[in-house]
């Protein structure tokens, strides 16, 4: 058994301590809707593969003003390699499709949970 | 071993409140929201709020707001839900149930605990 | 709220037997979409989570499937531990809501 902020679960390896901040910052978002989460701003939706986290923060960064997703902006500049400025895009975009931030914080926990049940947590 | 036990059946009169307890163990209970859901005698299953034990933030079914009230005392890994002006209707099992730890489902569930309201 | 609406109430079936229960929702919910199954006195227990993945320990004749507002619980091949009642769930907005159920009895 391994343990991820007490998730018990057989088989992957736990994944870093800040890996395990973003997933919590994350669900707390989702839980935490009292109202659209960023005035219902929409983001470009990515391809979930590799370099998610750069795509991802390419995706958010255009949301300005909006405090419920600063840390997790932060969190996800923790993850990519690069710097990532607002207008920026990679290949990862789906570039015809833009949806809530909320939804799109959940697509990116049920990637991140897809990557834990395979054993992918890098 | 993994489980949430709640507190034990309750009968009380129309007006009246109920406080019902759901204790974790096996768990880092702050790891984990903690949701509320009740099911009338022979009824479906209906989602009343959700509470993080972490900072005690919540969101309440809009149908219950104003009568439900959630809480936590993270020094016994216990959540609360009680329930206020009690209706007949209100007669129901109510279930806490753990919310997956990436959000998306109710992996664990309490036993439930059956609340009578009659007169 | 998002309303799910679950077909059939109840069916009669044996052991062996191949059975479908579906679940509508009012509007799209982007296969954020949970199974759940409960037996008397019991309370639920999760079955399959964004329409299509099995949770760890589930028997695999279990499988979910669908996509917009149309969703499929199937079980390839009934077992005696599968009469039950059947929940989805929405998880795509809040507030999170049921269906009405479909429960599964002996023929």
């Known amino acids: 058994l391994t343990c991820l902020g007490g998730f018990a679960s057989p088989g992957p390896v736990p994944p870093s301590t800040a890996l395990r901040e973003l997933i919590e910052e994350l669900v707390n978002i989702t839980q935490n809707q009292k109202a659209p989460l960023c005035n219902g701003s929409m983001v470009w939706s990515i391809n979930l593969t590799a370099g998610m986290y750069c795509a991802a923060l390419e995706s958010l960064i255009n949301v300005s003003g909006c405090s419920a997703i600063e840390k997790t902006q932060r969190m996800l500049s923790g993850f990519c390699p690069h710097k990532v400025s607002a207008g920026q895009f990679s290949s990862l975009h789906v570039r015809d499709t833009k949806i809530e931030v909320a939804q799109f914080v959940k697509d990116l926990l049920l990637h991140l949970k897809k990557l834990f049940r395979e054993g992918q947590f890098n | 071993e993994v489980q949430l036990v709640q507190s034990g059946a309750e009968v009380k009169k129309p007006g009246a409140s109920v406080k019902v307890s759901c204790k974790a163990s096996?768990?880092?209970?702050?790891?984990?929201?903690m949701h509320w859901v009740r099911q009338a005698p022979g009824q479906g299953l209906e989602w009343i709020g959700n509470?993080?034990?972490?900072?005690?933030?919540?969101i309440y079914n809009e149908k219950f707001q104003g009568r439900v009230t959630m809480t936590r005392d993270t020094s016994i890994s216990t959540a609360y839900m009680e329930l206020s002006r009690l209706r007949s209707d209100d007669t129901a099992v109510y279930y806490c149930?753990?919310?997956?730890?990436?959000?998306?489902?109710?992996?664990?569930w309490g036993q439930g605990t059956t609340v009578t309201v009659s007169s | 709220d998002i309303q799910m609406t679950q077909s059939p109430s109840s069916l009669s079936a044996s052991v062996g037997d191949r059975v479908t229960i579906t679940c509508r929702a009012s509007q799209g919910i982007r296969n954020y979409l949970n199974w759940y199954q409960q037996k008397p006195g019991k309370a639920p227990k999760l079955l399959i989570y964004y329409a299509s993945n099995l949770e760890v320990g589930v028997p695999s004749r279990f499988s979910g499937s669908g996509s917009g507002t149309d969703y499929t619980l199937t079980i390839s091949s009934l077992q005696p531990e599968d009469f039950a009642t059947y929940y989805c769930?929405?998880?795509?907005?809040?507030?999170?809501?049921f269906g009405g159920g479909t429960k599964v009895e002996i023929k």
């Open positions: 509470i993080n034990p972490k900072g005690g933030s919540n």
């Open positions: 769930q929405q998880d795509n907005r809040f507030p999170y809501t």
């Open positions: 149930a753990r919310l997956d730890y990436f959000g998306d489902s109710f992996d664990l």
């Open positions: 096996g768990y880092t209970f702050t790891s984990y929201w």
